[in-house]
């Protein structure tokens, strides 16, 4: 589904402005905040979504142990700089000239510095661990059923190829979804695991980015799967560079 022709909307991103001013009067959608044209047949990049969010009105042990290099997004929201493809620029700075380096999902991976800070390349996040706790149910979910339904969700709703869902772990009430995608594995047209994880995170929070779709209603053999806590860990192809001061 590209931009819907009938009422000219973007099915995959409600944070857009759409108008029939594309070639041949076709519906064309642009992201809020950046004004960049977006492809409504796939997920919009996290960078453009964050930028749009910042521009919007402000009212509204089978389990994996994250490695020592895993990053959690503790800094929260910021207004990012995106490149012409909609990816995060490796260096981000705020209005007070404080700068830092980010990975491909926009999470800070260095100490903060000044305008002299250099970020040589955008380091790819190749492994994302989504850690969920579900609300109590009559009994534990069947692990195989849970695996099947979460894979279906990422495949159907976020269009993420199944090969990038590396594993689904379950120890009631904790569910862990591992997404893996190396630079060499990602082909043109493949959804990025960082974008899929961000859409999932927003769905879980009841802040769906999809146009006109209901919120996430996930059921396993008819039993609702309701998430009460989410933590997302990001692992980069190159470990982050923080000073020892931050680690104490």
């Amino acid at each position: 589904h590209t931009a819907a022709q009938d009422n000219c909307t973007c099915p995959t991103n409600k944070m857009t402005v759409c108008s029939p001013d594309g070639p041949g009067g076709r519906c064309q959608c642009r992201a809020l905040g950046s004004g960049m044209a977006v492809d409504c047949s796939t997920l919009t990049s996290k960078c453009l979504l964050l930028k749009a969010r910042m521009s919007a009105p402000k009212n509204a042990r089978t389990l994996v142990r994250p490695s020592e290099h895993a990053l959690v997004d503790n800094d929260g929201l910021y207004d990012p700089d995106c490149d012409p493809e909609g990816r995060f620029k490796a260096r981000q700075c705020n209005q007070t000239s404080v700068c830092w380096c980010v990975n491909s999902v926009g999470v800070r991976r260095t100490d903060k510095g000044d305008l002299s800070l250099r970020c040589d390349e955008l380091v790819r996040t190749h492994h994302i661990l989504i850690d969920l706790r579900h609300r109590p149910t009559a009994g534990a979910f069947n692990h195989s059923d849970l695996d099947a339904e979460l894979r279906r969700l990422f495949r159907e709703r976020y269009r993420l190829h199944p090969k990038f869902v590396a594993a689904v772990h379950y120890e009631q009430p904790t569910i862990q979804i591992e997404l893996r995608q190396n630079t060499s594995q990602k082909a043109a047209g493949d959804v990025d695991i960082g974008d899929a994880a961000y859409y999932f995170e927003r769905d879980i929070k009841g802040e769906s980015l999809f146009q006109g779709r209901g919120g996430l209603d996930l059921r396993v053999r008819g039993e609702p799967l309701q998430v009460e806590r989410t933590l997302i860990y990001y692992l980069d192809e190159i470990p982050p560079k923080f000073s020892m001061k931050r680690l104490t």
Epitope: H143, S144, D145, D147, A148, E149, R151, R152, R155, E156, R157, H161, P162, K163, V165, A166, A167, V168, R213, G214, D217, R219, V220, R221, G222, E223
Partner: antibody, heavy 117, light 111 residues
């Protein structure tokens, strides 16, 4: 016991729209699972057409996507298939089936649809 | 799309024989905890009937002479001792990726 039953015209003219309905008993289609259409041309194999989920989400086979619509009427516990611009190649037995966790555990008995003028 | 290839396309056997049908996927249909490969039996004029789900799980009510095995791309359906009612066409189906796809079928006939 879950039961599915297909209904609709057995003969459709070329270029017209094929419309079939599947009536489900023994389970509410909005309570869970995925509700599918599958077809089988005479003497040939099975082809998945698409589904509508318990929450109303659709997924279609890309080979048919431009011509297919699957919808539902929860008040009647029915889901329907519309296939537009049919040709003789769409002649087949059409089955509705329930997808539990990505396999089909309950099937309708099937209905033969012939496309002919 | 994932292509599913069954072999043989047809086979003749006698009551009491042990029969094996194979199904090969063009790419892996397994996850870390699941094998998204299922087997169905179809008799003339009837709807397919689920026999085995997720490669090796016997559907409720299906006789124990049916069994399934395999992972990744190669899977097998075995009937340990053929009964007269087992003569039918058998299909494998993958659900790892959409579109879901079926094998072309294996017709099991009486020798």
């Amino acid at each position: 016991q879950v039961q599915l039953q297909e209904s609709g015209p057995g003969l459709v003219k070329p270029s017209q729209t094929l419309k079939l309905t599947c009536t489900v008993s023994g389970y509410s289609i909005s309570s869970g699972y995925y509700w599918n259409w599958i077809r089988q041309p005479p003497g040939k194999g099975l082809e998945w057409i698409g589904y509508i989920s318990y929450s109303g989400r659709n997924l279609y086979n890309p080979s048919l996507k431009s011509r297919v619509t699957i919808s539902r009427d929860t008040s009647k516990n029915q889901f329907s298939l519309k296939l537009s611009s049919v040709t003789a190649a769409d002649t087949a037995v059409y089955y509705c089936a329930r997808d539990t966790t990505a396999y089909f555990d309950y099937w309708g008995q099937g209905t033969l649809v012939t496309v002919s003028s | 799309d994932i292509q599913m290839t069954q072999s043989p396309s047809s086979l003749s056997a006698s009551v009491g024989d042990r029969v094996t049908i194979t199904c090969r996927a063009s790419e892996s249909v397994s996850s870390s905890v699941n094998r998204f490969l299922h087997w169905y039996q179809q008799k003339p004029g009837k709807a397919p009937k689920l026999l085995i789900y997720r490669a090796s799980n016997l559907e409720s009510g299906v006789p124990s002479r049916f069994s399934g095995s395999g992972s990744g791309t190669d899977f097998t359906l075995t009937i340990s001792s053929l009964q007269p009612e087992d003569f039918a066409t058998y299909y494998c189906q993958q659900s790892n990726e959409d579109p879901y796809t079926f094998g072309q079928g294996t017709k099991l006939e009486i020798k």
